[in-house]
Structures are given as C-alpha cells and as structure tokens.
C-alpha cells in the first residue's frame, strides 16, 4: 500500500514560520500577510517505526521537492540537514532511520524527536531569521514545540 501523507506547515511556539534559507537549510522567522506564502509546505509521511499513542514516526519531505529532513553525524554531532532523494523511490513506508522523526504530541504541541538520535529534537532559536537545527535539550532556551497547520493538497 502507498505511504499515507498529508500536507502541512509548521510554526514554532513563538509563532515563527519555517522558510527556505539557501538550497539545503530552513530558517525560522515571523511572517505576516503576503510573506506567509514563503513558508515551506511539508509532505508529512507516516512511516514504519516504533509507535505509541502519543508518538508517531513520520518523515518530513518538502512538498513537490525531492528534499527530506534528515539527521546525520557531522563533526561527531547530530545535525539536521535537507537531503536530496530520488523522487521515484520516495516517500516509502520503510524510510531509512535518518529520515524518521518521532512526532510526539504533548498539550496540543508537537515535538519532533530524531529516531536516529534519541533525545535530539528539531529546534529553533529565540532569535529571528536563524536556522532550524537539531538540538540536544528540551525545555531550555531553544524551542522544540511546534504547531501544525493542515494544507489542502
């Protein structure tokens, strides 16, 4: 069966939107009005992995682009990147672990934990116009809570 996907945008708990920053990076900043069109639309695919009531494994692709968020070691540090894939083969139910995030819902907020690197989360900073990254702390000054807005196909 084909993998189930939905289109959505994400905003951090400070209401910053996610936009492209160069070809292989996302950044977070406050957008309003027509600028909202800049925000990236994700194709969130529900993939194979360890699942529970509040934890669902997903892959985060960029809609109509052959780019997926992935987690890899760079200079011995877990790092978030946008990785180019062959669109003929993706998305798929059994995604490589670096593409998988545990979508965790807590109090109507979402966290995205790397399946490859447990306790590392998709993060933004308090500052405006700075990259989205993989952070190793929750509840500190970095932001790990997001809300999801559904986008019609």
């Amino acid at each position: 069966a084909p993998v189930r996907s939905l289109n959505c945008t994400l905003r951090d708990s400070q209401q910053k939107s996610l936009v492209m920053s160069g070809p292989y990076e996302l950044k977070a900043l406050h957008l309003q009005g027509q600028d909202m069109e800049q925000q990236v639309v994700f194709s969130m695919s529900f993939v194979q992995g360890e699942e529970s009531n509040d934890k669902i494994p997903v892959a985060l692709g960029l809609k109509e682009k052959n780019l997926y968020l992935s987690c890899v070691l760079k200079d011995d540090k877990p790092t978030l990147q946008l990785e180019s894939v062959d669109p003929k083969n993706y998305p798929k139910k059994k995604m490589e672990k670096r593409f998988v995030f545990n979508k965790i819902e807590i109090n109507n907020k979402l966290e995205f934990e790397s399946a490859q690197f447990p306790n590392w989360y998709i993060s933004t900073s308090q500052a405006e116009n700075m990259p989205v990254f993989l952070g190793g702390t929750k509840g500190g000054q970095d932001i790990t809570d997001f809300t999801m807005q559904f986008v019609s196909s």
């Epitope: 540090k77 900073s125 116009n129």
Partner: antibody
C-alpha cells in the same frame, strides 16, 4: 556597556594550531548568537563562524570548514575559536561579534591578529 | 553562496556632500541587509540593519533603502568623521557574505 575582548592571537607556523578567546561582558551572553569574522591585512571582511546561544547550532565558512571549531562556555561568558591546520591565508585580524536582530553584528571586539608564517 | 557586490569601490568626496553607495546581491535577500562603517585600525561599527533600520546612536544623516537584490546607503551631508570604508552584509542565509567595501576619501 557591551564589551567583547579577544585574545589568543599571535605568530604560528603553517600547520599549527591556535585557540582564540572572546570574553564578553555588559549583556546576557547566554542569550545571544555569536560570530567570528576576520579581516586579512588590507582586505575586506570575511564571516568565519556562528554559534547559537545553547551551542547546538554552529555554521562555518567553506574556507575554514573541518579546520576551525567554534564553541562557547556560557558559565564563563566566553566564546572560543579553535583553529587547526593553519594556512598562510588564515592570516588576519579575528573579531568576535554579538549577533543582533536578524543576523547583523551589533557589537564587535577590537580584534586579535593571527599571523601564519614560517 | 550569495555574492554581494558593492559600488563604487572607492570615491572621493567633500565635507557636506551627499553620497550614495550601492550594494547588489546575487539573489533575493528580502530585507536582510546590514551596513557597517570601519575606520583604519578599528573594528567595524553597525550603521543600518534590516536594510532600512538605523542602529541606535547612529546619526540620522545615514539612511538605507532597498529590498530584494538592490540596496543603497546614503550619507546626507558628509562629516569629517564619515571618511571611512563602508561594507554591506547579507544575513539571508549562511554563509553570511560581505560586499568588497567602499572607501570614502577626502577630495
């Protein structure tokens, strides 16, 4: 008053290492992104590296990637730049700078000179 | 990487002149542009951020304009202390990049 004071520069042979420090005062260091920017003698400005307040996010210019490492100790209000495998073209004044709104450098240190020569 | 091109690279002017420096980005950077002033032997000083916002403490004779790829720094009525080198810098994406600088000399 915001103050940034670099130290650790000097003369080093090609292939050698140096660690630069930047002592920050007059603001809540742990809340700010920080940059290293360099300027070769008689040349323009070149951005080198950035680090987030928590230290989890770092980025580097292609010219230093794999050789330089940015880090910080928020308990000591200090920013660092570990420079390995130094080359003659790394000769420059190295500035640390506090990152202001959206990615500008709103306060700069006075700079420390790194000379790579045999 | 985004290339930043400044013009002119140098200019001679007199006290009281109105001066315009142009900065062009190789791609759209929205309004994520800063301008700096550097005098010999000193660190750069932030003048303008977000293309048009005057940094606190900077005299109002300095102004910035533009968005997208084309930006200008204008100095109305040059003062003796304004003879320096000016740099633009894009903050749209990493790696951050600077223009090559514009040296403003006394005519």
């Amino acid at each position: 008053e915001v103050q940034l004071l670099e130290s650790g520069g000097g003369l080093v042979q090609p292939g050698g290492s140096l660690r630069l420090s930047c002592a920050a005062s007059g603001f809540t260091f742990s809340k700010y992104f920080m940059f290293w920017v360099r300027q070769a003698p008689g040349k323009g400005l070149e951005w080198v590296s950035v680090i987030s307040p928590s230290g989890w996010m770092t980025r580097y210019a292609d010219s230093v990637k794999g050789r330089f490492t940015i880090s910080r100790d928020n308990s000591k209000n200090t920013l660092y730049l570990q420079m390995n495998s130094l080359r003659a073209e790394d000769t420059a004044v190295y500035y640390c700078a506090r990152v202001g709104y959206g990615g500008n450098s709103d306060y700069w240190g006075q700079g420390t000179l790194v000379t790579v020569s045999s | 990487d985004i290339q930043m091109t400044q013009s002119p690279s140098s200019v001679s002017a007199s006290v009281g002149d109105r001066l315009t420096i142009i900065c062009r980005a190789s791609q759209d950077i929205n309004r994520w542009l800063a301008w700096y002033q550097q005098t010999p032997g000193n660190a750069p000083k932030l003048l303008i951020h977000s293309a048009t916002s005057l940094q606190s403490g900077v005299p109002s004779r300095f102004s910035g304009s533009g968005s997208g790829t084309d930006f200008t720094l204008t100095i109305n009525s040059l003062q003796p202390e304004d003879f320096a080198t000016y740099y633009c810098q894009q903050a749209d994406s990493f790696p951050l990049t600077f223009g090559g600088g514009t040296k403003v000399e006394i005519k």
